[in-house]
């Protein structure tokens, strides 16, 4: 069975295919292959010899025991290798050699006992090393990591690395690697000498599910004093063993890092006294809760130093009281509990992301809801119910809004956005807001993105609402209901490069009102019930137009239409999916495609 | 099309059946097994997944006795700092995890369920399995 | 088995050419693709060109690329290396490579080539 040509000539797919030798009806310029669950059991030496321009190699469960020497001899360009589940028992001690460009080496699930003996030392461009899931016992970085200079992460997860000591970070001292980020979760560790970590700079550590114990954790956190890391993860997996108990004891230990961002990933244990459980982490940059559950809700007004705060997927008893100073980024995501939005106090916020949480929204919005001027993004995306009783008052500075597929309320009774002269950025799509009032986008004179997809429209018609959206250059109006645009519509839009009309309800096309747009690149007319033109006939669309999408609509492929399709013909090199229009009357001609279609009408005499 | 069997509880019969042409094994086990009346038990999965797991969620397609419910999406892995450590497996990597579960209170009536659980993962998204249970619910008292 | 002799090496002025060849006995039925490495001193071997013998596709790296020329005689089975523009950073010992159905990797034992003036 042949591979599959996914990029001809360059990409080939031959996944599976009970292949007990490497290919060899390959052209010799493929670029990526993917040999991955082929019994191919032995890799002798030069291999891949008519591979010449190999950049990525998936060898994932080969069934690999033996890699000769040379096996991948002179694949100068190879990027990436993927060794995933091969059950190597014999690693030559040149197997890599020839891999003079390789960035990513990944042999997870490979045997592989210990990193001393694994024979990368000469891979000197290796940014990316995987070896989680393996049996390694000792921590050791051996002295040929002092090459690989350009390492940026070492995975090192899911092994059997019990302790680390002074001796075995060694190497780092002698090259510190500043943007190393290692990952160690999942090893059963119950001891980190203390000073092992003293001095060494890391990008990122993690450590998940570690500990077995409270005092292991503890201990081992201690372990950890002099280390300065960027960015530190600690917690647990939900499908592994949980820690019994968790109290501030357990990061004490932290008062003796430097730490620029903290995150606390999962943890099957009720946070109640945060205060004191964070008690090191009040100046860090970042602060981060992924799945966990907050008891008290009041503990986020003290005075803790985090210029970003991160909640995700988290568990509350209500929306949790917000006053911290010198914040300037709140994530508050996918959260669980305290339905009711409330106020919060964060002066010098500018970005706030409030998205997923199923929140409602009795007054929106104001300074006043925020605490804050300085707002410059705002994302109320998928939440309940918004009532927008304010035109944003005090935040002013906008320039990012998103409520997508939230349910807002009053939003054509007045000009909402009037005050927002900055904005760049809105996305009111599917918010059940339906179009009634002319003066709805006023104010918005700095808009480049608008996206109205899956609203309604008085009358399903389409009136004169964006004449002060002079900058707008993206426009998506699908999902409306739409049957009728006025022919001024887009007069004021000459910035316009994409405009969105798909799955809408027009029966007929007119090039008229879009004679003003004369940067339009993307037209989309797609999914209407778009038989015929509006007038006999069309003009031209802008000379600007790239691509025009008229696929899946209703065609009427007869005499009295040929002028029409004479014209949609004539606009081929502009239409994409050709195959795609087809003819939808009469019922002899259903489902032929428009353009191959030769109507030959007799003149009545 | 081949079925394979789960388990019987005192009031449920599980067993499901693949809904994709590639039928790639997976191994799942129950215990002890659900009871629809309250439940509380350990999943336990084997599987060698053909791509990456990032990014996995689940499309469900349930059907109660023949009446289809809207689909629902249900994400596992958001693709960073995952609740589950199998959301870091790699295509190839032998996936073999517990997980705990625990639900009570929701009472079902009698008759057939059936659940089409697509698994979608990676970037791009591609299909990674999919399954098709049907549990058979017999109330002792309802 | 197959066996792989390469001649045709040399000392050359830059700008020079030369012409290597490549003479396949033994189990040549057995061979799918056929090529030149070099090995510069220090340094490790890399691909030049290759041509495949089904068919007569071939690949040049980007270093040769318009200044050599692979070719093959079925009748003779023979592969020959035109080398025109010669520079200096063209000086290695060149080998002739060939690769069977099996994946197995045969080798010449390469000959010399230097461009200096």
């Known amino acids: 069975e042949p591979c599959v040509e996914v990029v001809p000539n360059i990409t080939y797919q031959c996944m599976e295919l009970n292949f007990y030798k490497i290919p060899d009806n390959l052209p010799f310029s493929t670029k990526n292959l993917d040999l991955s669950f082929n019994p191919l059991r032995h890799l002798g030496s030069y291999s891949f010899f008519s591979f010449p321009e190999l950049q990525v190699l998936d060898l994932s469960r080969c069934e690999i025991q033996t890699i000769e020497d040379g096996a991948y001899q002179s694949l100068s360009h190879l990027s990436t290798l993927i060794l995933t589940g091969n059950p190597i028992q014999s690693l030559a001690l040149g197997a890599f050699s020839g891999l003079s460009s390789l960035q990513k080496l990944v042999a997870v699930e490979t045997n592989l006992a210990s990193l001393e003996n694994f024979p990368i030392g000469h891979l000197k461009t290796l940014k990316e090393l995987n070896v989680a899931h393996n049996l390694i016992q000792s921590f050791k970085l051996p002295e040929y990591f002092s090459n690989l200079t350009n390492l940026e992460h070492l995975d090192l997860s899911s092994n059997k690395i019990q302790s680390i000591y002074c001796t075995d970070l060694r190497v780092l001292h002698q090259m510190p690697l500043l943007n190393l980020s290692l990952d160690l979760s999942l090893n059963p560790m119950n001891f980190i000498q203390p000073g092992a970590f003293k001095e060494i700079r890391l990008h990122k550590l993690t450590l998940r599910n570690n500990f077995d114990s409270l005092n292991v954790m503890k201990t081992c956190i201690q372990g950890l004093a002099g280390l300065e890391v960027h960015r530190l993860v600690l917690g647990e997996f939900r499908n592994e063993g949980n820690l019994e108990k968790f109290d501030k004891s357990a990061l004490e230990g932290l008062c003796n890092l430097t730490i620029e961002e903290f995150r606390l990933a999962y943890l099957d244990y009720y946070l109640d006294d945060i205060i004191d459980l964070f008690n090191c982490l009040t100046n860090v940059s970042s602060f981060s809760l992924v799945s966990v559950t907050i008891e008290r809700v009041k503990d986020f007004s003290y005075n803790f130093g985090w210029q970003h705060l991160e909640l995700v997927n988290c568990k509350f008893g209500q929306f949790p009281t917000l006053k911290l100073k010198s914040l300037k980024r709140l994530t508050f995501t996918s959260n669980k509990g305290g339905n009711a939005f409330s106020e919060v106090d964060l002066p010098s916020l500018e970005f706030l992301d409030l998205s997923r949480n199923g929140l409602s929204f009795k007054g929106c919005c104001s300074q006043s809801d925020f605490g804050t001027t300085s707002l410059k993004y705002l994302d109320l995306s998928f939440n309940g119910v918004i009532t927008m009783s304010s035109n944003f008052l005090g935040l002013e500075q906008l320039e990012h809004l998103d409520f997508q597929h939230s349910n807002l309320k009053q939003m054509s009774e007045f000009s909402v956005f009037l005050s927002l002269r900055n904005l760049i950025y809105l996305d009111i799509s599917h918010t059940h807001t339906r179009v009634a009032f002319n003066g709805i986008f006023n104010g918005l004179s700095s808009l480049e993105v608008l996206k109205m997809a899956g609203n309604s429209f008085q009358e399903n018609f389409l009136p004169d609402i964006f004449t002060e959206l002079r900058n707008l250059t993206f426009l998506d109006l699908s999902q409306c209901q739409l049957e009728q645009l006025s022919p001024t519509a887009f007069n004021s839009l000459s910035s316009l490069q994409v405009l969105n009309m798909s799955h809408n309800n027009f029966f007929s096309l007119d090039t008229f009102p879009y004679k003003c747009l004369n940067s339009l690149q993307v037209l989309d007319y797609s999914l209407n019930h778009i038989m015929t033109s509006k007038k006999q006939e069309l003009q031209h669309f802008p000379s600007s137009l790239a691509f025009l999408n008229l696929t899946q609509n209703d065609f009427a492929c007869t005499c009295e239409h040929q002028s029409f399709l004479q014209w949609i013909k004539d606009q081929r090199q502009l239409l994409v999916e050709v195959e795609r229009m087809e003819c939808a009357t009469p019922s002899d001609k259903q489902g032929m495609p428009v353009l191959s279609l030769n109507i030959t009408c007799q003149m009545n005499k | 099309q081949k079925q394979y069997w789960v388990c019987n509880s005192s009031d449920a019969s599980i067993s499901y059946t693949y809904c994709d042409k590639m039928q790639y094994p997976i191994s799942i086990n129950v215990n002890p097994c659900i009871e629809l009346k309250r439940s509380k038990g350990l999943l336990h999965i084997f599987y060698i997944p053909r791509r990456d797991l990032k990014q996995l969620y689940f499309n469900l397609y349930i059907t109660v006795n023949t009446m289809n419910l809207p689909k629902r999406k249900e994400v596992i892995c958001r693709g960073s700092d995952d609740d589950y450590s199998f959301c870091r497996a790699l295509k190839g990597e032998t996936v073999n995890t517990t997980i705990s579960f625990s639900f009570k209170g929701i009472k079902f009536s009698k008759g057939k369920y059936k659940c089409v659980v697509e698994a979608i993962s990676g970037s791009p998204e591609e299909m990674l399995f999919c399954l098709e249970f049907v549990i058979l619910h017999q109330p002792n008292s309802n | 088995e197959v066996q792989l002799v390469e001649s045709g090496g040399g000392l050359v002025q830059p700008g020079g050419s030369l012409r290597l060849s490549c003479a396949a006995s033994?189990?040549?039925?057995?061979?799918?693709?056929m090529g030149w490495f070099r090995q510069a001193p220090g340094k490790e071997r890399e691909h030049v060109a290759l041509?495949?013998?089904?068919?007569?596709?071939?690949y040049y790296a980007d270093s040769v690329k318009g200044r050599f020329t692979i070719s093959r005689d079925n009748a003779k089975n023979t592969v020959y290396l035109q080398m025109n523009s010669l520079r200096p950073e063209d000086t290695a010992v060149y080998y002739c490579?060939?690769?069977?159905?099996?994946?197995?990797?045969?080798w010449g034992q390469g000959t010399q080539v230097t461009v200096s003036s």
């Open positions: 490579g060939a690769k069977t159905g099996t994946s197995f990797v045969y």
């Open positions: 033994g189990s040549i039925f057995s061979i799918n693709d």
């Open positions: 041509i495949r013998i089904k068919d007569g596709s071939i």
